[in-house]
Interface confidence: low
């Protein structure tokens, strides 16, 4: 049997293999040692018994999408049946005082692999070391602490495989410099020691994406905006645009990145070297925001051809929006047509290639409440004898849209612990002036929060107010 027969049934075309060679990986045309690593078909009853106490789940994650040329990292974590864990020596033990289907477990071994292993196992040429090999019969590496590594992980993608010894977690990074853009599948099979052989305990696969466009995501925030996720913002208040570039391997760290903004409101093109930018829309309406991110990254040198002039360095047009489907876990660009780029083997020349990323959004600008202020605070005269509560009248003004609701939160002087919250619809005159009467339970210092809201906005102001005791000479104090 060959690796491809064991690990995956989808044939990987030969012409693709040539373009997508991974450094340190091997062709899945290699032979698989079926004696040391038995192959079980789906539905084989032995899968059920391959692990004591249940099935081991392998969870595979990656930091996809990856820009061509960057590194992409895959992590496999093994999740053991309930009440089982890996100890410091790499053995699998039952957790103390944990209740599983068998009742309470004591701290006994599920698998005590290191107890039977000794350094003599590594003596090459002896029958004892013949089993310390990967499925392609390569011997295991011998780093410090090898005895604690009880699992063999076989990663398989792009018609190639990579073998690794590990504990309950394994990590592999690949460089995407020679890879074709597009979605790919990574499959991982995990084996455990079983006497002098290795049996499969779990299999997992996941999609990852190689892209020739910079994966870009933009967060948009604005003071007084009621809902940050609805892409509705307020007129006459700055919106903060913050560009996040998905670059977990820091491939772009040494590249200068330029951001070209078109806000769709006829204010022209803004070019910036900063990932954050403020912009204020002064008209209501719907606007198409376009961002192009550009950078130069190390790339292939074009073959010398004196007769052909170099192509102009214009950005390609952004991809069409993806069909509505579940989005990938991290922000990604998955254009419908992937360009494949053959990378030359010339690595000693310092050529650079332009890469682009795109972000588009349709944002709606509406009128909102821009500002709230407390104009006046007045003590409401009370009949004699005075009740325990003090009544205060607050005169509040606002700018912008007419609020529909006013909320008052009375809290402790630190403004942390709310004591009372009252919301009510409001009738506001054309000048946006309203009077709010609130009761205070006894003397002391209070924090008073006023929020005025409408469908799109929520504006806030706070003040500290000192309610005097019942001595008629003690004054009311407000500290804004």
């Amino acid at each position: 049997k060959r690796f491809r027969d064991v690990l995956g049934h989808e044939q990987y075309p030969d012409h693709m293999r040539e373009h997508n060679q991974l450094r340190g990986w091997s062709s899945d045309e290699n032979e698989w040692d079926e004696h040391l690593y038995p192959v079980w078909r789906r539905g084989d009853g032995r899968w059920k018994d391959s692990w004591e106490g249940g099935r081991v789940q392998a969870v595979l994650t990656s930091d996809s999408p990856a820009l061509v040329g960057s590194n992409i990292t895959f992590v496999v974590n093994l999740v053991f049946p309930r009440c089982q864990k890996e100890d410091a020596n790499g053995n699998i033990v039952y957790e103390k005082n944990c209740r599983n289907d068998l009742g309470l477990t004591s701290d006994l071994h599920v698998y005590n692999w290191t107890a039977g292993a000794d350094d003599g196992d590594w003596e090459d040429g002896t029958s004892r070391s013949q089993h310390l090999r990967f499925p392609d019969r390569r011997p295991f590496p011998r780093p410090h602490g090898w005895k604690k590594w009880s699992f063999v992980y076989v990663f398989h993608t792009l018609g190639q495989y990579f073998q690794k010894l590990g504990r309950c977690s394994a990590r592999v990074s690949i460089n995407t410099v020679n890879l074709t853009a597009g979605p790919q599948v990574m499959e991982v099979t995990v084996f455990r020691r079983y006497g002098r052989a290795y049996i499969p305990i779990s299999k997992v696969k996941d999609v990852y994406v190689i892209t020739d466009q910079i994966p870009v995501f933009v967060t948009m925030s604005q003071k007084n905006d009621r809902n940050l996720s609805d892409e509705i913002f307020l007129r006459d208040l700055p919106i903060v645009f913050d560009v996040l570039i998905h670059d977990p391997s820091h491939f772009l760290n040494d590249s200068a990145i330029s951001y070209k903004w078109n806000f769709g409101d006829n204010t022209g093109l803004f070019v910036s070297n900063n990932h954050t930018l403020n912009h204020t829309y002064v008209l209501n309406g719907t606007f198409n925001l376009n961002l192009t991110v550009q950078t130069a990254v190390p790339g292939p040198c074009p073959p010398p051809s004196p007769s052909t002039p170099p192509p102009p360095s214009t950005p390609p047009s952004p991809p069409p929006s993806p069909l509505p489907t579940l989005s990938t876990p991290s922000p990604s660009l998955m254009p419908t047509g992937y360009k494949s780029m053959e990378l030359s083997d010339i690595s000693n020349e310092n050529c650079r290639i332009n890469r682009y990323g795109y972000f588009r959004a349709t944002i709606t600008i509406v009128e909102g409440i821009l500002e709230v202020s407390i104009m006046q605070i007045a003590d409401v005269p009370m009949p004699t004898p005075q009740p325990a509560n003090s009544l205060m009248d607050f005169t509040v003004t606002c700018k912008g849209a007419t609020p529909m609701e006013a909320c008052t939160i009375i809290s402790d002087p630190t403004c942390q612990i709310a004591q009372n919250r009252v919301c009510s619809p409001v009738a506001v005159d054309g000048l946006c002036l309203l009077s709010v009467r609130r009761a205070f339970n006894g003397s002391g210092t209070y924090c008073v929060n006023f929020t005025l809201g409408d469908d799109a906005s929520l504006a806030l102001t706070s003040t500290l107010i000192s309610i005097p005791g019942k001595d008629p000479d003690s004054p009311l104090r407000a500290v804004n």
């Epitope: 989808e10 789906r42 789940q57 599948v185 489907t325 579940l326 990938t328 876990p329």
Partner: antibody, heavy 120, light 107 residues
Framework: QLQLQQSGTEVVKPGASVKIPCKAS????????MNWVKQRPGKGLEWIGQ????????NDNGKFEGKATLTVDKSSNTAYIQLSSLTSEDSAVYFC?????????????WGQGTSVTVSS | SIVMTQTPKFLLVSAGDRVTITCKAS??????VAWFQQKPGQSPELLIY???NRYTGVPDRFTGSGYGTDFTFTISTVQAEDLAVYFC?????????FGGGTRLEIK
Amino acid sequence: QLQLQQSGTEVVKPGASVKIPCKASGYAFSSYWMNWVKQRPGKGLEWIGQIYPGDGDTNDNGKFEGKATLTVDKSSNTAYIQLSSLTSEDSAVYFCARSPLHLRGSMDYWGQGTSVTVSS
Amino acid sequence: SIVMTQTPKFLLVSAGDRVTITCKASQSVSNDVAWFQQKPGQSPELLIYSASNRYTGVPDRFTGSGYGTDFTFTISTVQAEDLAVYFCQQNYYSPFTFGGGTRLEIK
């Protein structure tokens, strides 16, 4: 237009078997998991298992071992569930539902369900 | 297998009310939780995936949150057409398991 088409109703005798089809159209059949979910009348949902048409890989709920077998026919873009040794406990609606490879449990499109009645 | 304990089992609310349903996993399932709506006589429909992501075309009155073992599903302003049974589901561990469901009825 994306569709998962299931047969309407199956009436079968106790001890017999039944094979329920789910015909997919409007998307890349081989690139999505196909899940099967059981729902007894007035009850909740029970996940039976899933199959990846791209390579026939399956991921099963051990509770249905020996009861449910999942297969696919890539040429007709059809997934099947075969239920064997049927009893009254197997009377239920069986849904097929697809899920993307990277979010294999998030079933975003469902068939209309096939009602299986086990009765002598 | 993971047990998903969903509460409450039944909700009787008025149109315009805010509704919260909770789901507790018997062990951590990261953020791999989905929420489904099943209207009478229909197939379930995906509303939320990966705990908090609203599926394409789902109105923004439906939201989800949570991580690890505790998850919450909220309808900010219930409408008459929201009459349905709502299910949570974990898809971190196989077998994937559903909560028992919450029947939402409108007064």
